[in-house]
Interface confidence: low
């Protein structure tokens, strides 16, 4: 499994999505776990409803929620009030008996609130020391709309000036395409931007 990077702004919500084959994982509950070290165990954070058919009901553990669209084949994890200590390596898992299949490996990166006007060097709290050069990157940046009917990320302000990115990312990375994910019903605070690396060939 390649690692998919999700970036969120400190203090706001980050949504992580894990697509999967709904037929292959029919009847299976799902879980979100945090990887403890490179080769350590994956510590369960939250799992879907005990009754698989009720997996669409959102379950919370502290500030982390999980919901599963078992027919659409999308597991969604919400990290509310994102903090620097939330940065790290996670997994979306499909459970069967005492076994767990990895649906997606996720690296969560926490960006400083852009409204703090810090230097670019302060914007990234890396979760892991390893480099993920082949990672599939999804910037899921949500922020409150600034007194406008449009979320601020849909404003006409140049992308490079308004998206807080880690310093090792170019504001508009070559080879990436920008797409708006319409999920306003799940992200009342703002919006999400997904940057999908064109050369990524990871399989779920």
């Amino acid at each position: 499994h390649n690692t998919t990077v999700f970036q969120g702004v400190a203090g706001q919500s980050l949504q992580v999505s894990c697509p999967y084959d709904s037929m292959k994982h029919w009847g299976r509950r799902k879980a979100w776990c945090r990887q403890l070290g490179e080769k350590g165990p994956c510590q369960r954070v939250v799992s879907t409803h005990n009754l698989w058919l009720l997996s669409f009901l959102r379950r919370w553990n502290g500030s982390t929620a999980i919901t599963d669209d078992t027919l659409g084949g999308t597991l969604t994890i919400t990290l509310r009030n994102l903090q620097p200590h939330d940065a790290g390596l996670y997994q979306c898992q499909s459970l069967h008996g005492s076994e767990a299949d990895t649906l997606r490996k996720v690296l969560v990166e926490v960006l400083a609130d852009p409204l703090d006007h810090r230097d670019a060097g302060d914007l990234w709290f890396p979760g892991e020391s390893e480099s993920f050069e082949d990672a599939h990157v999804e910037h899921s940046i949500s922020r409150p709309s600034q007194g406008s009917h449009l979320p601020s990320c849909l404003s006409k302000e140049p992308l490079g000036r308004r998206n807080p990115l880690p310093t090792h990312f170019h504001p508009s990375p070559p080879g990436l395409h920008l797409s708006h994910q319409d999920s306003s019903s799940q992200r009342p605070l703002g919006c999400s931007l997904a940057w999908t690396e064109a050369r990524d060939t990871s399989t779920q």
């Epitope: 292959k24 029919w26 009754l51 698989w52 058919l53 009720l54 027919l71 659409g72 069967h96 008996g97």
Partner: antibody, heavy 119, light 108 residues
Framework: QVQLVQSGAEVKKPGASVKVSCKAS????????MSWVRQAPGQGLEWMGV????????VYAQKFQGRVTMTRDTSISTAYMELSRLRSEDTAVYYC????????????WGQGTLVTVSS | DIQMTQSPSSLSASVGDRVTITCRAS??????LAWYQQKPGKAPKLLIY???SLQSGVPSRFSGSGSGTDFTLTISSLQPEDFATYYC??????????FGQGTKVEIK
Amino acid sequence: QVQLVQSGAEVKKPGASVKVSCKASGYTFTGYHMSWVRQAPGQGLEWMGVINPVSGNTVYAQKFQGRVTMTRDTSISTAYMELSRLRSEDTAVYYCARIPSYTYAFDYWGQGTLVTVSS
Amino acid sequence: DIQMTQSPSSLSASVGDRVTITCRASQDISNYLAWYQQKPGKAPKLLIYRASSLQSGVPSRFSGSGSGTDFTLTISSLQPEDFATYYCFQYRHMPSQTFGQGTKVEIK
């Protein structure tokens, strides 16, 4: 008690479409997935697909992809199955069946709707 | 697609007989298997789910066993009302063919 009541028998011409309804009562409609299964005369059971009444999301059997559409109206606790471009081999009894959370297999079935495709 | 193969396709038995029907999956389905009974002109009735769990209201003479690819439905003492067609059904995966072809239990 749980009941799934289906619409009446239909006779259709080849190339036409048919829409079968399944009205649920006696339980919370949005708490269970609804599946559709058909059975040709003298033949076995064939799974067609399943719908989540909450989201409306569906999974269809590969054989029926592009021809079947499953929908629901939660306000009247009714699921629908529409099959288009009918051919004679679609002549069958069509069943809706509820999937409970404790089994994941179909526990309650509708009485069946006979669809006859004939020119 | 996963193929479900039932055997035998039909059998003749007498009241009181012990009857065994087998179902083989073309790949591992864990214990995601159900057994149904169907009588002519009627909708199928769930007997067993999760390979061995007896559905509420089903007589205890029906039992299921197996895991992985090989499964068995057993009727310990056949009753007159048990003459019917029995289907296995896998729901670990959802391809187009998920039911077995059926086993017809007839009176000898």
